[in-house]
């Protein structure tokens, strides 16, 4: 059967049952995921907006799939095995009375079972297994997976030690409002701004105060963590992402096949081993690549570097440099340059800094 082909998995609680406090629902679901992460290399992150791998839904009757719920009793919940779209999603029958204890139907115990399905497990014939098809209350304080459950899940994902072989370090989510926060790369994607840091990215929708944190691997499983530079050509629905001496092309938010490719295909000399930052200016149809204290200008129409480059950043971008971490283009006249925890709004028509901000100023910090 299907399995998740990545170890960092996101979930989102779409809506909440009125039977329980929201905090109790959050806790029950978080603990249920933890049951499985304790015995596998899998890591689960809750996101509050956007597309999660696993959507948790409370619904009654017909609710958007072929498997309508049946009222109180009978079917308590169901979940879909790993995959895109509805894949992984867990649906809980709102006609049950969901609880934190032995009365009604215990949400934690049911969620452990359903998440087992979300991860690719079928039913077990062992009555002691949480994956046994019928619900039976057990003391949640002493609850343990059975040997059969552990054997099943580890046959799909291995044991927790396999974390050490993951390409992504298990670095925790950076604090968004930490005044010292810096970013690895920033780019617009349509009306959104993507801020990359380690294995995460934040998504900022223009003019909206809310942002959501996501794992890079949850959106683009084939991409590495630690993206170092990014830029968008909106007219082509293309985003270019850079790490080390490689780059990836994303079209309409989908990674293109046959990537990564070498950054040297842009025409960089061999001594360039990585890109610090990049930005595309649609007015000139040029991309600026920032490498250490220099920058190159690339003609996207002719697909070649402009002559006379590299140039010094400090010479041509007054007040910026000598090195930068990230940059993006906005509002038809500004570059936003990021240096450590500071950010500079730069008017490229006036060729000067018009505002100095904290790097995380976009998040209402």
């Amino acid at each position: 059967g299907p399995v998740w082909r990545k170890h960092y998995i996101t979930y989102r609680i779409n809506n909440y049952t009125p039977d329980m406090n929201r905090e109790d629902v959050d806790y029950a679901i978080r603990k249920a995921f933890q049951v499985w992460s304790n015995v596998t290399p899998l890591k689960f992150s809750k996101i509050n907006t956007g597309m999660a791998d696993i959507l948790v839904v409370f619904a009654r009757g017909a609710h958007g799939d072929f498997h309508a719920f049946d009222g109180k009793g009978g079917i308590l919940a169901h979940a879909f095995g790993p995959g895109s779209g509805i894949g992984g999603d867990a649906h809980f029958d709102e006609d049950e009375f969901w609880t934190t204890h032995s009365g009604g139907t215990n949400l934690f115990l049911t969620a452990v079972h359903e998440i087992g399905h979300s991860l690719g497990l079928g039913h077990s014939s062992d009555p002691k297994a949480v994956m046994f098809p019928t619900y039976k209350y057990v003391d949640i304080n002493t609850f343990r997976l059975s040997a059969d459950d552990i054997r099943g899940i580890q046959s799909l994902y291995g044991d927790p030690k396999e974390n050490q072989r993951l390409p992504n370090p298990d670095n925790s989510e950076p604090a968004l409002c930490d005044p010292n926060l810096s970013f690895d790369a920033v780019t617009t994607v349509g009306n959104k701004i993507f801020f990359f840091k380690d294995r995460f990215f934040w998504l900022k929708v223009s003019e909206r105060p809310k942002t959501s944190v996501n794992l890079i691997s949850s959106l683009w499983p084939t991409l590495p963590s630690g993206i170092e530079a990014a830029y968008e050509i909106e007219a082509r629905n293309q985003v270019f992402l850079f790490k080390d001496d490689k780059y990836w092309l994303i079209s309409n938010l989908r990674p293109e096949p046959n990537y990564p490719k070498s950054i040297h295909s842009f025409g960089f000399p061999n001594f360039v081993k990585k890109i610090d930052a990049a930005v595309f200016n649609p007015r000139f149809y040029r991309t600026y690549f920032f490498v250490d204290n220099q920058y190159w200008r690339y003609d996207e129409r002719r697909q070649m570097m402009d002559p006379g480059y590299p140039k010094l950043i400090t010479k041509n971008f007054q007040g910026i440099g000598p090195k930068i971490d990230a940059v993006f283009y906005s509002k038809n006249k500004y570059y936003y340059f990021f240096q450590g925890s500071n950010q500079f709004e730069y008017d490229f028509l006036l060729q000067r800094i018009t505002k100095t901000l904290k790097s995380n100023s976009w998040f209402g910090c």
């Epitope: 059967g1 779409n14 597309m51 959507l55 839904v57 609710h63 958007g64 799939d65 072929f66 498997h67 169901h78 979940a79 879909f80 095995g81 995959g83 895109s84 779209g85 509805i86 894949g87 999603d89 399905h117 079928g122």
Partner: antibody, heavy 122, light 103 residues
């Protein structure tokens, strides 16, 4: 390459019966839900019936419940639709469609056959 | 029961036009919505699944958006081969279809 080939359509009188078949190839048939979807002449698409990968669960549209029976033979990679008590309003092209999932149906049909025409008329 | 309402039922447009077709559910279906294209005498083909994911091999001029009850299919720049009928679908419910014709 996934291929679905329907057969068994034809002209039948009201009240009569017909059995449609769908021969599948190019994928592991026994792993996936399969469905029948129909389209009356000049009309839109109407889902008819679906069956789980193992054959143990079947679901039907209200319009055909009690008259049509879906089944499958995983050893022959074949899906069937037994249609009894046929009515004029059952006249349609019947398509066989592959779901992308096995345990629960996603309702997402990623491959379709070319269809077979069933005409119910006296 | 869930119902899907698709609009418009027919639409005339020219090559190069941007076209939007909408589909509305009478209750939340999260992002469980798919779009299909059907040409005369042919079987339907999957274009977009899970509201916004482009099926492999489908040109990038097609895009989908929406969640909950309101969904859209957009063709950014119509090509001659795009004139066809489009259906939204959620599980066993199809929209009534939108016939896209040449102006």
């Amino acid at each position: 390459e996934v291929q679905l080939l329907e057969s068994g359509g034809g002209l039948v009188q009201p009240g009569g019966s017909l059995r449609l078949s769908c021969a599948a190839s190019g994928f592991t048939f026994s792993w996936y839900w399969m469905h029948w979807v129909r389209q009356a002449p000049g009309k839109g698409l109407e889902w008819v019936s679906g069956i789980v990968s193992s054959g143990g669960t079947t679901i039907y549209a209200d319009s055909v419940k009690g008259r049509f029976t879906i089944s499958r033979d995983n050893s022959k990679n074949t899906l069937y639709l037994q249609m009894n008590s046929l009515r004029a309003e059952d006249t349609a092209v019947y398509y066989c469609a592959k779901d992308i999932r096995g345990a629960y149906s996603s309702g997402l049909f990623d491959h379709w056959g070319r269809g077979t025409l069933v005409t119910v008329s006296s | 029961d869930i119902q899907m309402t698709q609009s418009p039922s027919s639409l005339s447009a020219s090559v190069g036009d941007r076209v939007t077709i909408t589909c509305r559910a009478n209750q939340s279906i999260y992002t469980y919505l798919n779009w299909y294209q059907q040409k005369p005498g042919k079987a339907p083909e999957l274009l977009i699944y899970a509201a916004s994911s482009l099926q492999s091999g489908v040109p990038s001029r097609f895009s989908g958006s929406g969640s909950g009850t309101d969904f859209t299919l957009t063709i950014s720049s119509l090509q001659p081969e795009d004139f066809a009928t489009y259906y939204c679908q959620q599980a066993g419910i199809f929209g009534q279809g939108t016939k896209l014709e040449i102006k």
